[in-house]
Amino acid sequence: QGWQAFKNDATEIIPELGEYPEPPPELENNKTMNRAENGGRPPHHPFETKDVSEYSCRELHFTRYVTDGPCRSAKPVTELVCSGQCGPARLLPNAIGRGKWWRPSGPDFRCIPDRYRAQRVQLLCPGGEAPRARKVRLVASCKCKRLTRFHNQSELKDFGTEAARPQKGRKPRPRARSAKANQAELENAY
């Protein structure tokens, strides 16, 4: 799910290359993490579960061709995509009446691109057109970057993780002195 956010009109993701045909199971599981109907908890994990690999800011690789109009790169480029959670979940849903709100237990961090690299690619065009050279910006590394209450939805959307988006039926964090976090947190490395 996360990697699709990096697709734009100038690129096409080629699943048939076999390097990353579909979102990994970790991301599939993550989709359930923030659904209001699940109370913010993954449905099938027992309370004691500690899975180090599942909840971390990871650099996933996928391969894509670069396109520009009818022209396409001679070779696919390999890019990193930032995926996963930065540390244990830091939100606990609290029900008050019919509404739900969050209580934080720490700053909100997101796994986002850190450094980029430029790569020169040759684009082949149909109809005997001369090949074009083009520079593309690719993600080179990821980091756990802190979000503030001032980040708006459009900024969050760019991070490409469902967990970054506000959920229906939930109010923003209240001003709470105390902090509790998701009961089903899993161990993690940043």
């Epitope: 830091r90 720490g106 980091k143 756990c144 001003r175 902090a179 976090a181 089903a184 947190e185």
Partner: antibody, heavy 123, light 107 residues
Framework: EVQLQQSGPELMKPGASVKMSCKAS????????MHWVKQNQGKTLDWIGE????????GYNQKFKGKATLTVDKSSTTAYMELRSLTSEDSAVYYC????????????????WGAGTTVTVSS | DIQMTQTTSSLSASLGDRVSISCRAS??????LNWYQQKPDGTFKLLIF???RLLSGVPSRFSGSGSGTDYSLTIYNLEQEDFATYFC?????????FGGGTKLEIK
């Protein structure tokens, strides 16, 4: 008064494991994440990781992954850190620190610190 | 990881002086910068959070400023109890990282 009381000094052999404690008092233990920080002989500080006392969920600095394990005992309002496969590099003072929150500025900081546990690894 | 650099490892000053301690981050940390004081007995105390916000109970002679990658802690009218080691810490990117510390000594 909010306090974090840490266990006493430890003299350990290389290869051994040590488990130190951090007893919290004066506040609701499950309402604040507990963090651990290492201070080596050169006085530099390294953040080890955090644990949520409410759930037991922990997160670690990659540098300490496999070295440190954080746990809590809610009934005794105590946080623990175990260090394994000790080497001389692990000789340091280890601090537990509570992560506090300022709701006006939406900011977080280590507002209460323990006095530290000195670990010496020597053969 | 973000590197936090306190270029001055030790600083000598006299009672009543004004001193500034600098801290530089290897990248922009969006003002998520805290300052801590460590006394000779090893005890830590938070002084300033979010670059310039004084924690309740901390004397007003302590002041923080900065933005982007460059930050500083200024202590006005130095008192005996201020002679200690001061650390900066960034809270913008995980893992949290600290500066190497600046030891303030009496001249």
């Amino acid at each position: 008064e909010v306090q974090l009381q840490q266990s006493g000094p430890e003299l350990m052999k290389p290869g051994a494991s040590v488990k130190m404690s951090c007893k919290a008092s004066g506040y609701t233990f499950t309402d604040y994440n507990m963090h651990w920080v290492k201070q080596n002989q050169g006085k530099t500080l390294d953040w080890i990781g955090e644990i949520n006392p409410n759930s037991g969920g922990a997160g670690y600095n990659q540098k300490f992954k496999g070295k440190a394990t954080l746990t809590v005992d809610k009934s005794s309002t105590t946080a623990y850190m175990e260090l394994r496969s000790l080497t001389s590099e692990d000789s340091a003072v280890y601090y537990c620190a509570r992560l506090g929150y300022d709701d006006i500025y939406d900011d977080w900081y280590f507002d209460v610190w323990g006095a530290g546990t000195t670990v010496t690894v020597s053969s | 990881d973000i590197q936090m650099t306190q270029t001055t490892s030790s600083l000598s000053a006299s009672l009543g002086d004004r001193v500034s301690i600098s801290c530089r981050a290897s990248q922009d940390i969006s003002n998520y910068l805290n300052w801590y004081q460590q006394k000779p007995d090893g005890t830590f105390k938070l002084l300033i959070f979010y670059t310039s916000r004084l924690l309740s109970g901390v004397p007003s002679r302590f002041s923080g400023s900065g933005s982007g990658t460059d930050y500083s802690l200024t202590i006005y009218n130095l008192e005996q109890e201020d002679f200690a080691t001061y650390f900066c810490q960034q809270g913008d990117t995980l893992p949290y990282t600290f500066g190497g510390g600046t030891k303030l000594e009496i001249k």
